[in-house]
């Protein structure tokens, strides 16, 4: 029964290969891999990329084999294929393998980066949508602003990322985000760098509210100068004729 | 969307041999299994065998003498072919099809009649 | 071959009558799969995998069991619903399927 690690292209149909409690999981959990056929078999093999044998066997004359990984280290993470058998194959025939499962054993997931769409500046009245990008699908993600203890957002994503919308009056502050697996056993994240959101160019209202005064100042004086040249004018059309300025 | 419709000849005498073809529509054979079922008149379903997507068959060991499945992917089409009919042959012939790794049927054709009489 | 026999084979139920009919296997299996056939027309998949329930199909049908014996049950019994039953596995070779449960609007 030694075989190639990815057996060679068969015309029988290829199983399903799951992983109970999940496929990202921390050092020390019991994982079970549960290989499908379509049909029942009578061999099942779990299959690791370039080793030459099956890594494990299972005999069950059934649809179903179940593979025990017993407090699974990281060094039993990585790709995982499952193929079966039939008795009436002939020797050595295997079924096209399942579709790859990656095996994730880790105590915290890599640190996701936090950006803010379009940009961190908000104008008045915007809306800002931040991105919390991590590396694996399926993942629940969770947002946090600075000074608030409860997480302000959550979001189950299928995608690597997660979308969280702030509205535009309250988007100003600090925030963080980290991201963890949807289910027990929960595997953390570490937290993203802080982002900060701010209002456009918060410099610039002050700079208009000075303009402001200065153009106020401004219409005074022409104001001024305007009633002035008036009275000037009216005083000289009162003059006695002969005298002139 | 997925369809499945039986075609055959309705009457046979004893003896002779069937014929029931299976003509689908959206889904290629080369990507999904198609098994054959019979319903004699008022009973139960029997299960035949099997064609799939990779040219490989399974038969119902009780009826394996007498049964041979065969397709032609570019004509999406599957063929029961069954030998030395009795009259307990007679029923209503289903082909369905079975999407994916979960061992039961996803759709059904509407079935062809088969009557093995003299 | 895995032999699954249907209790009962005929029953009757009023409207918004809670109705559990039983598929029990000679040995055991890992997963029922359930098909309703209306008279005259091809069975259509009704539940799989001993639980779930097939696209379209009410929420007041349930499935549940496991080893060698399943059941699909009714909350409550609709004039719809009326049908023959069958269970089927394929835990072993042949596949199989029960004999039927036919449930008739009384």
């Known amino acids: 029964d030694i075989t190639p690690s990815v057996p060679p292209a068969s015309y029988h149909p290829k199983p399903w290969l799951g992983a109970q409690p999940a496929t990202v999981v921390t050092p020390g959990v019991n994982v079970t891999l549960r290989c499908r056929a379509p049909q029942p078999a009578w061999r099942f093999g779990l299959f690791k990329p370039g080793e030459i044998a099956p890594l494990l066997f299972r005999d069950v004359s059934s649809e179903l084999a179940e593979f025990f990984l017993e407090e699974v280290t990281p060094a039993q993470g990585g790709s995982y294929r499952c193929c079966y058998r039939r008795p009436d194959w002939g020797p050595g025939v295997w079924s096209q393998p399942s579709d790859v499962l990656e095996l994730l054993v880790t105590e915290e997931l890599p640190r996701p980066s936090l950006v803010a769409l379009p940009g961190p500046v908000v104008g008045p009245g915007a809306n800002v949508s931040l991105r919390c990008a991590g590396r694996l699908r399926n993942m629940s993600f969770v947002l946090y602003r600075e000074g608030v203890a409860a997480p302000l957002q959550y979001r189950h994503s299928a995608q690597p990322w997660a979308d969280f919308t702030l509205l535009g009056a309250r988007a100003p502050g600090t925030y963080s985000c980290y991201y963890h697996t949807p289910s027990a056993p929960y595997v953390l994240s570490q937290r993203s760098e802080v982002l900060v959101i701010s209002w456009e160019d918060s410099g610039s209202s002050d700079y208009t509210r000075g303009n402001l005064v200065r153009l106020g100042l401004a219409g005074l004086v022409l104001i001024s100068l305007g009633a002035l040249v008036t009275f000037d004018w009216r005083s000289q059309n009162r003059a006695p004729a002969g005298i002139r300025p | 969307q997925v369809q499945l419709k039986e075609s055959g000849p309705g009457l046979v005498a004893p003896s002779q041999s069937l014929s029931i073809t299976c003509s689908v529509s959206?889904?290629?054979?080369?990507?999904?299994?198609v098994h054959w079922v019979r319903q004699p008149p008022g009973k139960g379903l029997e299960w035949l065998g099997v064609m799939w997507a990779g040219g490989s068959t399974n038969y119902n060991s009780a009826l394996m003498s007498r049964l041979s499945i065969s397709k032609d992917n570019s004509k999406s089409q599957v063929f029961l072919k069954m030998n030395s009919l009795q009259t307990d042959d007679s029923a209503m012939y289903y082909c369905?099809?079975?999407?994916?790794?979960?061992?039961?049927?996803?759709?059904w054709g509407q079935g062809t009649t088969l009557t093995v009489s003299s | 071959q895995i032999v699954l026999t249907q209790s009962p084979a005929i029953m009757s139920a009023s409207p918004g009558e809670k109705v559990t009919m039983t598929c029990s296997a000679s040995s055991s299996v890992n997963y029922m799969h359930w098909y309703q056939q209306k008279s005259g027309t091809s069975p259509k998949r009704w539940i799989y995998?001993?639980?779930n329930l097939a696209s379209g199909v009410p929420t007041r049908f349930s499935g549940s069991g496991s080893g060698t014996s399943y059941s699909l049950t009714i909350s409550s019994m609709e004039a719809e619903d009326a049908a023959t039953y069958y269970c089927?596995?394929?835990?072993?070779?042949?596949?199989?399927f029960g004999a039927g449960t036919k449930l008739e609007l009384k």
């Open positions: 089927q596995q394929w835990s072993s070779d042949p596949l199989t």
């Open positions: 959206g889904f290629s054979l080369t990507s999904y299994g």
């Open positions: 995998d001993t639980s």
């Open positions: 369905a099809l079975q999407k994916g790794y979960g061992n039961y049927f996803d759709y």
